[in-house]
């Protein structure tokens, strides 16, 4: 689907992640581990990290590298959306952002990436090995989901081979050219991991003064589309069920997503007042039947309707109002 792999420069992990192996030795395996994790998922990337300043606070960052116009992003935990996962946030380019505890702040970072900060206290706080998933719907192309979680807290991602749970089944075109390099890298990584087994495992030492963790490049729309393979940060998936649905989701479900458009109009960057009515700005929109993205808003049965949207002014805006729904 894409032609050339454009891999952003990876910065080394935070200083606190340098253990017995030392800074230099750790960076290469980290890069290789990331490549091994994400090689099969050229469309969606997920990065999960624990805040150095708040050990029980998580930041999930997700990005979409495919073509089309992003029409909906759903972030869930405890598994893929619609397959046992529980929705944490739903981001719509026109209708705004909706989030549920323990999500603290969901926002658009660029036109093709989002971030979500999770509160770390209370019954609904995530465990360190919770799996987080991001699903991107792109009009008129399709929808893809990928998942990730934090490496075990006792080790900065080198103690076990990754077991990613990508729901994404995108074509592998565009990454074939680097497959040889990846194969070599993965083999080399395994070699390093075996050597590393005989050393004391570096402990996670979050530094309160450490710089912000490396961030993925802010892809402009054309860059996002050109990228064949984006290297996020190494994720190792284990499983940890979130708090009960009652605890985690006291709010009503997104009734406004009962019937959703499959498309979002052009979204130039910059602040804007998003349309929030179901009436199209012009009569040219199509109806959406059968709740195309109803699953994105599936909530516990006990929850009720009624949503007020608080569009993120920093996010992308729509050229016109949302699609009319039947």
């Amino acid at each position: 689907m894409r032609t050339e792999a454009q891999v952003p420069a990876l910065q080394p992990p935070e200083p606190g992640l340098e253990g017995a192996m030392g800074h230099r030795t750790l960076v290469l395996p980290w890069v290789l581990l990331t490549l091994c994790v994400t090689a099969g998922t050229p469309e969606v990337w997920v990065q999960v990290r624990m805040e150095a300043t708040e050990l029980s606070s998580f930041t999930i960052r997700c990005g979409f590298l495919g073509s089309g116009s992003i029409s909906l992003v759903t972030v869930s935990w405890g598994g893929p959306n619609g397959a046992g996962g529980t929705t944490l946030a739903v981001l719509h380019p026109e209708r705004g952002i909706r989030q549920w505890a323990p999500a603290r702040q969901a926002r658009w970072e660029t036109q093709s990436s989002i971030s979500l900060i999770l509160e770390g206290s209370g019954a609904s706080s995530p465990c360190a090995n919770t799996t987080f998933c991001c699903k991107f719907a792109s009009f008129p192309e399709g929808s893809w989901e990928a998942c990730g979680s934090l490496p075990p807290s006792s080790d900065p991602g080198l103690s076990a081979p990754p077991t990613p749970a990508p729901i994404l089944r995108a074509d592998l075109a565009g990454i074939l050219g680097v497959s040889g390099v990846l194969l070599f890298g993965c083999v080399y990584l395994l070699h390093l991991l075996r050597r590393h087994k005989h050393r004391p495992a570096p402990r996670l030492q979050p530094s309160r003064t450490s710089p912000q963790a490396p961030r993925a490049r802010a892809w402009a729309p054309s860059q996002a589309s050109q990228a064949a393979l984006h290297v996020p940060y190494a994720t190792i998936n284990t499983s940890c069920r979130p708090a009960t649905l009652d605890t985690a989701h006291p709010h009503g479900g997104p009734s406004w997503w009962a019937s959703l458009p499959t498309h979002a109009a052009h979204r130039p960057q910059g602040p804007a007042a998003w349309a929030s009515t179901p009436i199209p700005a012009r009569g040219s929109f199509v109806s959406v039947e059968n709740g195309l993205y109803a699953q994105a808003g599936e909530r516990p049965p006990h929850t009720g309707p009624g949503l007020t949207l608080f569009p993120d002014p920093r996010g992308p805006r729509a050229m016109e109002g949302p699609l009319g729904v039947r």
């Epitope: 116009s69 729309p221 054309s222 040219s284 929109f285 109803a294 050229m319």
Partner: antibody, heavy 113, light 107 residues
């Protein structure tokens, strides 16, 4: 890579209905929506609508919402488009596409008495 | 619906020549534009997505660009297999709409 195989040409009488198919190879739609596009002989293309194979959700061009019905059979990874109340204006080639990247070879529909 | 005006409707050119096809959008579509190629047997292939990104397997002689509401597909050096039909497709607003097409003929 998704490969889409469409059903063969059809000749039907005005007023009838027709159902054409679009089979995805490899037993997967790979996350792609199936779009349907109309092309009148030697003319440009017109988007009819799309279906999300994962849940059967549809999105129609208003112009075709009473003319076309899109469905999908996940078990056979086949998408269908039914066209009703056919007239000579419906005589065209109809394409299915996975997103906008993977295209079927087209199905020729001829409406004639 | 957004109108996509494609020009020229037909174009005669020689092998090795550089040509540009243009689509103009009736309203702002950002970079939400693809270019498609259709062969005489009806086979359709996407060449460019998101205005300027080349699809996998598409020769580098094809490129896409934008200037305001004008979108261009440029073929830097025509080869024999390039003499087919080309269409632009906008997907910024539903329904997606296509340009009228350009028939590229050998001179």
């Amino acid at each position: 890579e998704v490969q889409l195989q469409q059903s063969g040409p059809v000749l039907v009488k005005p007023g009838a209905s027709v159902k054409m198919s679009c089979k995805a190879s490899g037993n997967t739609f790979n996350g792609y929506y199936i779009n349907w596009v109309k092309q009148r002989h030697g003319k440009s293309l017109e988007w009819i609508g799309l279906i999300d194979p994962s849940n059967g959700g549809t999105n129609y061009n208003q112009k075709f919402k009473d003319k076309a019905t899109l469905t999908v059979d996940k078990s056979s990874t086949t998408a269908y488009m039914e066209f009703n109340s056919l007239t000579s204006d419906d005589s065209s080639v109809y394409y299915c596409a996975g997103g906008t990247v993977y295209w079927g070879q087209g199905t020729t529909l001829t409406v004639s008495s | 619906d957004i109108q996509m005006t494609q020009s020229p409707s037909s174009l005669s050119a020689s092998l090795g020549e550089r040509v540009s096809l243009t689509c103009r959008a009736s309203q702002d579509i950002g970079n939400n534009l693809n270019w498609l190629q259709q062969e005489p047997d009806g086979t359709i292939k996407r060449l460019i997505y998101a205005t300027s990104s080349l699809d996998s397997g598409v020769p580098k002689r094809f490129s896409g660009s934008r200037s305001g509401s004008d979108y261009s597909l440029t073929i830097s050096s025509l080869e024999s297999e390039d003499f087919v039909d080309y269409y632009c497709l906008q997907y910024a607003s539903s329904p997606p709409t296509f340009g009228g097409g350009t028939k590229l003929e050998i001179k």
